[in-house]
């Protein structure tokens, strides 16, 4: 990896698990410079592989609310608005980092956790399994 | 929101900015219980709205490497393998949390940051703007 010169103004850590345990400021900085007003908002409905969004809530997690996509059909919507089963709708998944309260119910102590979320769906050509 | 009873075994925080600054264990727990062997691995190529993945690296961020999807075409791939410009390939974006070293170059002090990433692409019916 890239070696970073240490800033002399860094806070000191007395934690015996250092550098495993770090200090994190929860005052979120939003770097979304994207000013495009048309984001993924209505793609779920206009897609040829449409999906629904389901609210996943967990008070022991930060962020506590995550939206999960579920593809509406196994096939894809064709030009006539019907489902075409010669094509497959599949979820696009991403591994994201969240904070899990640890020990449980603690307001100021967390552990990083990796979870797999489904963000939306895409239409793919099926894999054809040839029988020998 | 849901009120969580505080665990008496929680670590104490002397930080003057508490509860804005919290302790986070970076020993990642992987909660991906999904045993589905077929994940999004080859969807980028098989999709009717195919995409390429670009590596975005930033040593001041955790995770330092994030993969960004960029749609290959403005249109979508039709049954003949040609690009159909009557349909649009669009990126599916998601806001994710990352940790930003703050102050810069500090190994044990971070600030939560929200960034918008493109995870993949989907094929949508275009919005038709009727001229009055």
């Amino acid at each position: 990896g890239i070696t970073i010169p240490r800033n002399p103004g860094c806070p000191n850590s007395e934690d015996k698990n250092f550098p495993r345990t770090v200090m994190v400021n929860l005052n979120i900085h939003n770097r979304n410079t994207n000013t495009n007003p048309k984001r993924s908002s209505d793609y779920y409905n206009r897609s040829t592989s449409p999906w629904n969004l389901h609210r996943n809530e967990d008070p022991e997690r930060y962020p506590s609310v995550i939206w999960e996509a579920k593809c509406r059909h196994l096939g894809c919507i064709n030009a006539d608005g019907n489902v075409d089963y010669h094509m497959n709708s599949v979820p696009i998944q991403q591994e994201i980092l969240v904070l899990r309260r640890e020990p449980p119910h603690c307001p100021n102590s967390f552990r990083l956790e990796k979870i797999l979320v489904s963000v939306g769906c895409t239409c793919v050509t099926p894999i054809v399994h040839h029988v020998a | 929101g849901i009120t969580i009873p505080r665990n008496p075994g929680c670590p104490n925080s002397e930080d003057k900015n508490f509860p804005r600054t919290v302790m986070v264990n970076l020993n990642i727990h992987n909660r991906n219980t999904n045993t589905n062997p077929k994940r999004s691995s080859d969807y980028y190529n098989r999709s009717t709205s195919p995409w390429n993945l670009h590596r975005n690296e930033d040593p001041e961020r955790y995770p330092s490497v994030i993969w960004e999807a960029k749609c290959r075409h403005l249109g979508c791939i039709n049954a003949d393998g040609n690009v159909d410009y009557h349909m649009n390939s669009v990126p599916i974006q998601q806001e994710i949390l990352v940790l930003r070293r703050e102050p810069p170059h500090c190994p044990n002090s971070f600030r939560l940051e929200k960034i918008l990433v493109s995870v993949g692409c989907t094929c949508v019916t275009p919005i038709v703007h009727h001229v009055a």
Partner: antibody, heavy 124, light 113 residues
Framework: QVQLQESGPGLVKPSETLSLTCTVS????????VSWIRQPPGKGLEWIGI???????DYNSAFKSRVTISVDTSKNQFSLKLSSVTAADTAVYYC??????????????????WGQGTLVTVSS | DIVMTQSPLSLPVTPGEPASISCKSS????????????LAWYLQKPGQSPQLLIY???TRQSGVPDRFSGSGSGTDFTLKISRVEAEDVGVYYC?????????FGQGTKVEIK
């Protein structure tokens, strides 16, 4: 516990609109989708349509021009409207909850909880 | 529409004995992306609404006794009851949830001999 209860008139005149309500309790509306299914006397089950958690709908093409499914989340109620009915629409009408599976990334069209059903007779 | 054909349509059974119902689909119910078969079994007891027994061909719904088991793939599926009990009487339906509209078999009536 999970409960679904259908209600509405038991008798509808031909060419009129059949209107039924399904009141639900014991589960989260934002998570689950609800289907309507019917069963003509002495016959099998026929899926009419679904309303997804976000309010979108999908209908059996056999009913498409006549059917509307809607939701009133404030009342925990779903409704089915079937227009231009004939004697062939006489049936027991069920509302049913579509199964929700957490780590599964498709909508589910298996029904894991059903109402008790309501008989609607179409006759003049 | 996908046609689901069950056999037999009537099945007289003896308590304690096994029973088997067949369901055939006019098209394959196997989804290539996840290798799941989109087939379910329901039981409608006399005077009641249907209840889900099995989904994805062989996954038992919670609370369903383990004497019920499902098998098959593609277009041919089977529901087996290892030892029939008196409470198992009713009409059994298979249902496909791959293709819209989601269709049911015509039903198999299981009754005690």
């Amino acid at each position: 516990q999970v409960q679904l209860q259908e209600s509405g008139p038991g008798l509808v005149k031909p060419s009129e609109t059949l209107s039924l309500t399904c009141t639900v309790s014991g589960f989260s509306l934002p998570s689950h989708s609800v289907s309507w299914i019917r069963q003509p006397p002495g016959k099998g089950l026929e899926w009419i349509g679904i309303i997804w958690n976000q309010g979108g709908t999908d209908y059996n093409s056999a009913f498409k021009s006549r059917v509307t499914i809607s939701v009133d989340t404030s009342k925990n109620q779903f409704s089915l409207k079937l227009s231009s009915v004939t004697a062939a629409d006489t049936a027991v009408y069920y509302c049913a909850r579509n199964m929700y599976i957490t780590d599964y990334y498709y909508e589910n069209y298996f029904m894991d909880a059903w109402g008790q059903g309501t008989l609607v007779t179409v006759s003049s | 529409d996908i046609v689901m054909t069950q056999s037999p349509l009537s099945l007289p059974v003896t308590p304690g004995e096994p029973a088997s119902i067949s369901c055939k689909s006019s098209q394959s119910l196997l989804f290539s992306e996840n290798q799941k078969n989109y087939l379910a079994w329901y039981l409608q007891k006399p005077g009641q609404s249907p209840q889900l027994l099995i989904y994805w061909t062989s996954t038992r719904q919670s609370g369903v006794p383990d004497r019920f088991s499902g098998s098959g793939s593609g277009t041919d599926f089977t529901l087996k009851i290892s030892r029939v009990e008196a409470e198992d009487v009713g009409v059994y339906y298979c249902q496909q949830s791959y293709y819209t509209p989601y269709t049911f078999g015509q039903g198999t009536k299981v009754e005690i001999k």
